[in-house]
């Protein structure tokens, strides 16, 4: 039961995390105009990975896409790449983990196969979360650097009569969404990896089972011992040796002939 709960929770947490990563990637507020030193502007500037926007005090918002690839900073391109890789890995991980869930039956899929799929999706979620966290952190670092550079320019460029107000940018909502989402995806991935350990059939269990079975008048198939190698139809083997040393979790997972996807 604990394994199913861990796997299910890991899936849900990762699902929320990946949804958050997608949301963060699409959001326009990666960087927002810093109003701390300049609260008098009648416009509010904010920027995303794909476009920059200006909200006027009149209420009108105008957004312009970055319609160039070559003219964009390499760091921005890197952040885009990291977020997209995170989304793609996360999406594949979700797809794999759906089939790996214990509560879902696909034909006669073995627990060992489900364990492998759970581990694969877990690793994918971990990498996806790390990509998102890395992407957001790179962007945040870029903002901090630019913030202090523009602050320095503010105080050194006051010599002339005509002043140009520097628009400084600070952390936008998307950064926090991205960090949290990346963290959730990472946690979900770790939970999937933990669940994988509980799903994997243990060799000792099956040896104990086989000895126990030999004392019964049960006609077992020769394929029964294949379970110990991690291959073969272990779900059917388990059904044969019903009196063995199984966990409560394993007992509940036995499919009947009426179990379908």
């Amino acid at each position: 039961m604990a394994v199913t709960a861990c796997q299910g929770l890991g899936f849900v947490v990762s699902l929320i995390g990946i949804a958050g990563i997608i949301a963060a990637t699409c959001m326009d507020q990666w960087s927002t105009q810093d109003l701390y030193n300049n609260p008098v502007t009648a416009v509010f500037n904010y920027q995303g990975l794909w476009r920059s926007c200006v909200r006027e005090s009149s209420g009108f918002t105008e957004c312009r896409g970055y319609f160039t690839l070559l003219g964009l900073p390499a760091m921005l391109q890197a952040v885009r790449a990291l977020m997209i890789v995170g989304i793609v890995l996360g999406a594949i991980g979700l797809l794999v983990s759906i089939f790996a869930l214990k509560c879902i039956r696909i034909g006669s899929m073995e627990d060992s196969a489900k364990a492998n799929m759970t581990l694969t999706s877990g690793i994918m979620f971990i990498v996806s979360g790390l990509c998102a966290i890395a992407g957001v952190s790179v962007f945040a670092n870029m903002l901090v650097t630019n913030f202090w550079m523009s602050t320095a320019n503010m105080y050194t460029g006051m010599g002339g009569m005509v002043q140009t107000v520097q628009t400084r940018y600070t952390f936008g909502a998307a950064l926090f969404v991205g960090w949290v989402a990346g963290g959730l995806t990472l946690i979900g991935g770790v939970m999937m990896c933990i669940a994988c350990r509980g799903l994997a059939p243990e060799e000792t269990n099956y040896k104990a089972v086989s000895y126990h079975a030999s004392g019964h008048s049960v006609a077992y198939k020769p394929g029964g011992f294949k379970a110990s190698t991690g291959f073969g139809s272990n779900t059917k083997n388990k059904k044969t040796y019903d009196g063995g040393a199984h966990t409560e979790d394993e007992l509940q997972s036995y499919p009947s002939k009426h179990d379908y996807v």
Epitope: Q33, V40, T41, A42, V43, N45, Y46, Q47, S52, C53, V54, E56, S57, S58, G59, F60, E62, R64, V162, Q163, T164, V165, T167
Partner: antibody, heavy 118, light 113 residues
Framework: EVQLQESGPELVKPGASVKMSCKAS????????IHWVKQKPGQGLEWIGY????????KYNEKFKGRATLTSDKSSSTAYMEFSSLTSEDSAVYYC???????????WGQGTSVTVSS | DIVMTQSPSSLSVSAGEKVTMSCKSS????????????LAWYQQKPGQPPKLLIY???TRESGVPDRFTGSGSGTDFALTISSVQAEDLAVYYC?????????FGSGTKLDIK
């Protein structure tokens, strides 16, 4: 047709208060900010502040803060400006104007003339 | 506060002539976010409220004759009337739309000879 109809002329004594109105029609009142501008006779224009009818949130020019109070009433699509502690310096025409794209005032009221005299 | 300086304070031209008036701001009115200049031009005829002519430094308001042209960027702006008409007799004001408090220039009075 967009219209901003301001209240009639006012003759008030020094130290008194005056409340003028600006009734909007021809558009959705809560979608546009209303600004107030002062113009002394034969002089230029001076921005007093604005009221956001959607949020009822005002913003003032520091020069007029404390003496000007901007409010609005959604039900009647009317913006109000109350001016207190009037002096002869406050004798002017007061305009309300709608703020549009580009932060520009595209429609103006006809103005309310306020004369402060004892 | 942003100081808007208009010049000349008044000018007198004959109908059909081209006229250009200047407006300088003490700070740049160019917003980096959208590369747009937040400056407006208004026309005020005697006994009337101001009328919006140009916003965004160069965008003509709908219904405004195309003889009115706004130009400039940053701190230096101009309003040009390509062929002055008798009905153009008015005071022209420029206004900072980017920073609070919104500030107006002292105006350029246009007289027709």
């Amino acid at each position: 047709e967009v219209q901003l109809q301001e209240s009639g002329p006012e003759l008030v004594k020094p130290g008194a208060s005056v409340k003028m109105s600006c009734k909007a029609s021809g558009y959705t009142f809560t979608n546009y900010i209303i600004h107030w501008v002062k113009q002394k006779p034969g002089q230029g224009l001076e921005w007093i502040g604005y009221i956001n009818p959607y949020t009822d949130g005002p913003k003032y020019n520091e020069k007029f803060k404390g003496r000007a109070t901007l409010t609005s009433d959604k039900s009647s699509s009317t913006a109000y400006m109350e001016f207190s502690s009037l002096t002869s310096e406050d004798s002017a025409v007061y305009y309300c104007a709608r703020l549009n794209r580009g932060n520009a005032m595209d429609y103006w009221g006809q103005g309310t003339s306020v004369t402060v005299s004892s | 506060d942003i100081v808007m300086t208009q010049s000349p304070s008044s000018l007198s031209v004959s109908a059909g002539e081209k006229v250009t008036m200047s407006c300088k701001s003490s700070q740049s009115l160019l917003n980096n976010g959208n590369q747009k200049n937040y400056l407006a031009w208004y026309q005020q005829k005697p006994g009337q409220p101001p009328k919006l002519l140009i916003y965004g430094a160069s965008t003509r308001e709908s219904g405004v004759p195309d003889r009115f042209t706004g130009s400039g960027s940053g701190t230096d702006f101009a309003l040009t009337i390509s062929s002055v008409q008798a009905e153009d007799l008015a005071v022209y004001y420029c206004q900072n739309d980017l920073y609070y408090p919104f500030t107006f220039g002292s105006g350029t009075k246009l007289d027709i000879k």
